[in-house]
């Protein structure tokens, strides 16, 4: 089977979404979890994980093959305490599969905005934290 | 067994906005996607959306997007729809039904005792 | 969107007797097609699943078949019990939907 681990961000106001994202066919989600980390570059695990979430088993239609299963970890306001290095990671339990997601960072700036680099879909988003645009 | 527990009929003025509620019990909640149902008397049924309660994923017919909300608290195993600027055709009787796993069962296994909502002045 | 056309719109029957009901679909579902029994002041229960699979506690009488586009629902020597309204719906592809639903009333 062929499992896809991607990771996105998106801003509602000062809200700051974090995503993850897995496509993946119904007879692999079986014990499988997908989380989000924090500064955790070697022992990334649904434990130190600051949100986890199982995989769908069903993608609530008949006429599909894949199913995505979405964990999104929402940070209200965005401080310097949440600048950091992030990953999305997912793990099987019955096969012992792990999947990394790409690193993407947090950097909260001196002028009270933050960036976030790395993201795969786009390769740079910057926010303004006051004013709550997408620049 | 499985149940689905659906809030008492509602009253409710045009313009107005209500939420009702659908306890689920005797099965994972989170596993299972919840559908959302408007049965207008004497009529058939129409199928609002659904959600499923383990990622928040929430599925809707062109219709009544903008019009219905669907939530789920997973620590209540409660799934609730949101109406909003309510009107005289949003009078119906609402369902809540749970989706069968795919490929096992697939159609809607349980179904709530329905709750009707009446909109008027 | 999939438009599933069900007919007769009623169905008048003696008892005793047996029917078929038919469910179109405005595109192939494969066997993805569901029906529901509703009478009046009741919540609809699940008959058939996936157009021709038995469901546990609904009398061997009733059955269904169909794949693609054109499904029936028939049922062997109706009773009195089984007057009421019944529903297709499909679950092949978003937004899930019903057909508009047979009524089966005593003749």
């Known amino acids: 089977g062929c499992i896809n681990i991607t990771s996105s961000a998106s801003q509602e106001g000062t809200r700051l979404n974090l995503i993850c994202t897995v496509w993946h066919k119904k007879e692999e989600a079986e014990g499988f979890v997908v989380f989000l980390c924090k500064d955790r570059s070697g022992d990334c695990s649904p434990e130190t994980s600051l949100k986890q979430l199982r995989l769908k088993r069903d993608p609530g239609i008949d006429g599909v093959g894949e199913i995505s299963s979405q964990l999104m970890f929402t940070i209200s306001q965005v401080t310097p305490l949440h600048s950091g290095t992030y990953q999305c990671c997912a793990r099987s339990q019955k096969s012992g599969i792990r999947l990394q997601g790409h690193f993407f960072s947090i950097l909260f700036t001196e002028t009270g905005n933050y960036t976030v680099t790395g993201l795969k879909q786009r390769q740079h988003l910057e926010f303004s934290h006051n004013e709550g645009t997408l620049s | 067994q499985v149940h689905l527990q659906q809030s008492g009929a509602e009253l409710a003025r045009p313009g107005a906005s209500v939420k009702l509620s659908c306890k689920a019990s005797?099965?994972?909640?989170?596993?299972?996607?919840m559908q959302w149902i408007k049965q207008r008397p004497g009529q058939g049924l129409e199928w609002i959306g659904s959600?499923?309660?383990?990622?928040?994923?929430?599925r809707y017919t062109q219709k009544f997007r903008g019009k219905a909300t669907l939530t789920a608290d997973k620590s209540s195993s409660t799934a609730y729809m949101q109406l909003s600027s309510l009107a005289s055709e949003d009078s119906a009787v609402y369902y809540c039904?749970?989706?069968?796993?795919?490929?096992?069962?697939?159609?809607?296994?349980?179904w709530g005792q329905g709750t009707t909502l009446t909109v008027s002045s | 969107d999939i438009v599933l056309t069900q007919s007769p719109a009623t169905l008048s029957v003696t008892p005793g007797n047996s029917v078929s009901l038919s469910c179109r679909a405005s595109?192939?579902?494969?066997?993805?097609l569901h029906w529901y029994q509703q009478k009046s002041h009741e919540s609809p229960r699940l008959l058939i699943k996936?157009?021709?699979q038995s469901i546990s506690g609904i009398p061997s009488r009733f059955s269904g078949s169909g794949s693609g586009t054109d499904f029936t629902l028939s049922i062997n020597s109706v009773e009195t019990e089984d007057f009421g309204m019944y529903f297709c719906?499909?679950?092949?592809?978003?937004?899930?939907?019903f057909g508009a639903g047979t009524k089966l009333e005593l003749k």
């Open positions: 005797g099965y994972t909640f989170t596993d299972y996607w």
């Open positions: 595109q192939s579902i494969s066997n993805h």
């Open positions: 719906q499909q679950s092949n592809s978003w937004p899930l939907t």
């Open positions: 959600i499923y309660p383990g990622d928040d994923d929430a």
């Open positions: 039904a749970r989706r069968g796993i795919a490929a096992v069962v697939g159609g809607f296994d349980y």
């Open positions: 996936y157009a021709s």
